[in-house]
Each structure stands twice: as C-alpha cells, then as structure tokens.
Interface confidence: low
C-alpha cells in the first residue's frame, strides 16, 4: 500500500469543475507557456566533453508530433587534446515528458496520455568498475 | 481510451489536427516507465560536471514532483578530483509537458503546460570572448 504523500491535497471538487465521464479526464491541449524558449548555452552539444547529436522523431498521431532525442557521439569522453578518452564514459541524461496519443479504432478515435522518456543530452562520468571475485 | 465517434463517412473526414480539448483515459500509458535497470542513476555524483537535485512540488500539477538540477561548480572536475576552471559546467535544459489543473483544484480537468527543467549538467569548453 502507498503511504499518503506529504503535502498531497485531497481535492475538494469546486462547483466550477466541468462534468467529466467516469474513467476519463478533460484535457485542454492549448499549451500554457507555448512560446517559452530554451536559453541553453550556445552549441553545448558540440562543445561538451561528451558531445551528442539530435534526431527529430515525427508522429502525426502524437501531440506534440515532434520529439527531439539526443544520442551521445562517443562511448568515451573528449579530452583536452580533442581525442576520445575511453577511461571515461559519455552517458545519456534522460527526462520524462507527457504526450497525447491519438488511437484509431475503425471509424472512432480515442486519446491516451503517455509518458515518453527523452534523452536530452550527455554527460561525462567516471565509470563504475565491478570487481569480480 | 475514451472513444469518440467520428463523422459519418469518416474515411474522408480525417482531421489532421488535434482538437483543442480532448477526453483522455485516466490511466497514463508507461506510467511507471521501466528504464534499463543496469543504467546507473548516480550520474549526478560521478559526472565531471556534477549536480545537485532540488525537489519542486506543486499539487496543482501532474507530475506533482519534478527534480531540478543545479550544477555544483562553475568549472569541471579533472582527473585529480579538483575543479578545473578552464572548463565550464553548464545545465542541460529541456522543455517538458506537464498537466496543470484547470480550473484550479479540479480533480479531472487539466491543461497541458510547457515547463523548462534543468535535467543535469555537462562539461563544455568555454567560449572565450577576446576584447579588442
């Protein structure tokens, strides 16, 4: 069993809440902060000691249709001489995001929320060495 | 999911765009994303650009808890375990979609919200600006 989450609010349904059929929820997909822009340092994917490339995945039955995934370029990390150092590891950093999936069943359509794991970039780590007895 | 009947003659009336408001199933697919168990989760400590994770909690949002990364150093950790200020630790940021309760406090009514999170840090060669 789950212990109650600290700070969890058991929502008292206000009168203004829209009626929703059982087992479903109403979702407005007009995005709040739609025009917010990422202000990351310039070209960090190329300047990183664990550089990465981006691939855009496209799915018309997903909202948003476009999801960008990063892939580490190397197994090792780039040293000060610009060479790959395989004593260190480039590893992916991942983050979950939500998408809306549209499903077709004959002449009907349904919508499902889905968690997607996005690789956002890479970082250089010291490897874990497992010693075998 | 919740099935919505399409217009008669639906093969020709396929709408390429998503409607502004949809009814979605309460069950979230991949809710417990089963990431590779062999992937170590201590990158934040082992990275040459280590970071701390700060908890951001908001009961009006799903997921209610999001972790924000903050780089520990301006520089990066070198082979001797010291901070090398010739390199920079920088945050990797990502826009993610979350659900915001709308109207507030309603249990089953949400709006998508885009938020910017720092997921981790990476070590980069600095851009050096030479002043004439």
């Amino acid at each position: 069993r789950k212990i109650p989450k600290v700070g969890h609010t058991f929502f008292q349904k206000p009168e203004s809440c829209p009626p929703v059929p059982g087992g479903s929820m109403k979702l407005d997909i007009g995005i709040i902060n739609e025009n917010q822009r990422v202000s990351m340092s310039r070209n960090i994917e190329s300047r990183s000691t664990s550089p990465w490339n981006y691939t855009v995945t496209w799915d018309p039955n997903r909202y948003p249709s476009e999801v960008v995934q990063a892939q580490c370029r190397n197994l090792g990390c780039i040293n000060a001489q610009g060479k790959e150092d395989i004593s260190m590891n480039s590893v992916p950093i991942q983050q979950e995001t939500l998408v809306v999936r549209r499903k077709h069943q004959g002449c009907s359509v349904s919508f499902q929320l889905e968690k997607v794991l996005v690789t956002v970039g890479c970082t250089c780590v010291t490897p874990v060495i497992h010693h075998v007895q | 999911g919740i099935t919505i009947p399409r217009n008669p003659g639906c093969p020709n009336s396929e709408d390429k765009n998503f409607p502004r408001t949809v009814m979605v199933n309460l069950n979230i697919h991949n809710r417990n994303t089963n990431t590779n168990p062999k992937r170590s989760s201590d990158y934040y400590n082992r990275s040459t650009s280590p970071w701390n994770l700060h908890r951001n909690e908001d009961p009006e949002r799903y997921p209610s808890v999001i972790w924000e990364a903050k780089c520990r150093h301006l520089g990066c950790i070198n082979a001797d375990g010291n901070v090398d200020y010739h390199m920079n630790s920088v945050p990797i940021q990502q826009e993610i979609l979350v659900l915001r309760r709308e109207p507030p406090h309603c249990p089953n009514s949400f709006r998508l919200e885009k938020i910017l999170v720092s997921v981790g840090c990476t070590c980069v060669t600095p851009i050096v600006h030479h002043v004439a």
Epitope: R1 | N32, V65, W67
Partner: nanobody, 122 residues
Framework: EVQLVESGGGLVQAGGSLRLSCAAS??????MGWLRQAPGKEREFVAA????????YYADSVKGRFTISKDNAGITVYLQMNSLKPEDTAVYYC?????????????????WGQGTQVTVSS
C-alpha cells in the same frame, strides 16, 4: 503486487546499531529501497539496492554508516544501521520500484510496507 513486511525496529542509544529486515513476496522488482519519515518531516530516501544486487545507492546523510544488502534468493533486503544518531529517529519503510533512474525520488516507489519505528535516544 509485492507484499512487504518490515521488522527489526526498536529503541537504541546513540552510537548503537540496528538491523532492519524487509521480506518481499510477489512479483519481481528493479529496486528495493528503504525510506524514512520523521514526525512532521517529509518522507526521505535512505538507501536502495537493485534487483540483481549489483548496485546500491545511499543518501549522503547515511553513507558510511548504513549498509543495504539482500539474501541470495532476493526475498529479504536488510538495512544494517551503525553509529546511529538521534536524527535517524523515524518510521522506516521498505518499498519497491521499477527502474533505477532517480532512485531517491520517494514518489516513484510503488509498493510499501507498513513501516517499523526506529528511535535513537541521546
């Protein structure tokens, strides 16, 4: 669903030791963790071990003092607590989760035991 039963809590003096056990039955898991909740405080991650037993994770506050381990069958997970401090006083829960990414996020644990009280007196 995984059923979890904790034992081994109790009252101990500062500097003393306790060994908590958590017996699991049911489906497999990717990680089992110990989490604790002190009165009036948030639930916090203490330690976790992967299903294979290869990987262990500790909160900074217990590193070097606490050791998480499991038996060969993977049915029981232990938390050996040494050099206990009064601030370790809390209800200790064992819980399972899927995935090893961000094991310290207590919200990601799915199945919880009933908890065992650990009190450290000064």
């Amino acid at each position: 669903e995984v059923q979890l039963v904790e034992s081994g809590g109790g009252l101990v003096q500062a500097g003393g030791s306790l060994r908590l056990s958590c017996a699991a039955s049911g489906r497999t898991y990717d990680a089992m963790g110990w989490l604790r909740q002190a009165p009036g405080k948030e639930r916090e991650f203490v330690a976790a071990i992967s299903g294979s037993g290869d990987d262990t994770y500790y909160a900074d506050s217990v590193k070097g003092r606490f050791t998480i381990s499991k038996d060969n069958a993977g049915i029981t997970v232990y938390l050996q607590m040494n050099s206990l401090k009064p601030e370790d006083t809390a209800v200790y829960y064992c819980a399972t989760r899927r995935g090893l990414y961000y094991v310290w996020d207590s919200n990601d644990y799915e199945n919880w035991g009933q908890g065992t009280q650990v009190t450290v007196s000064s």
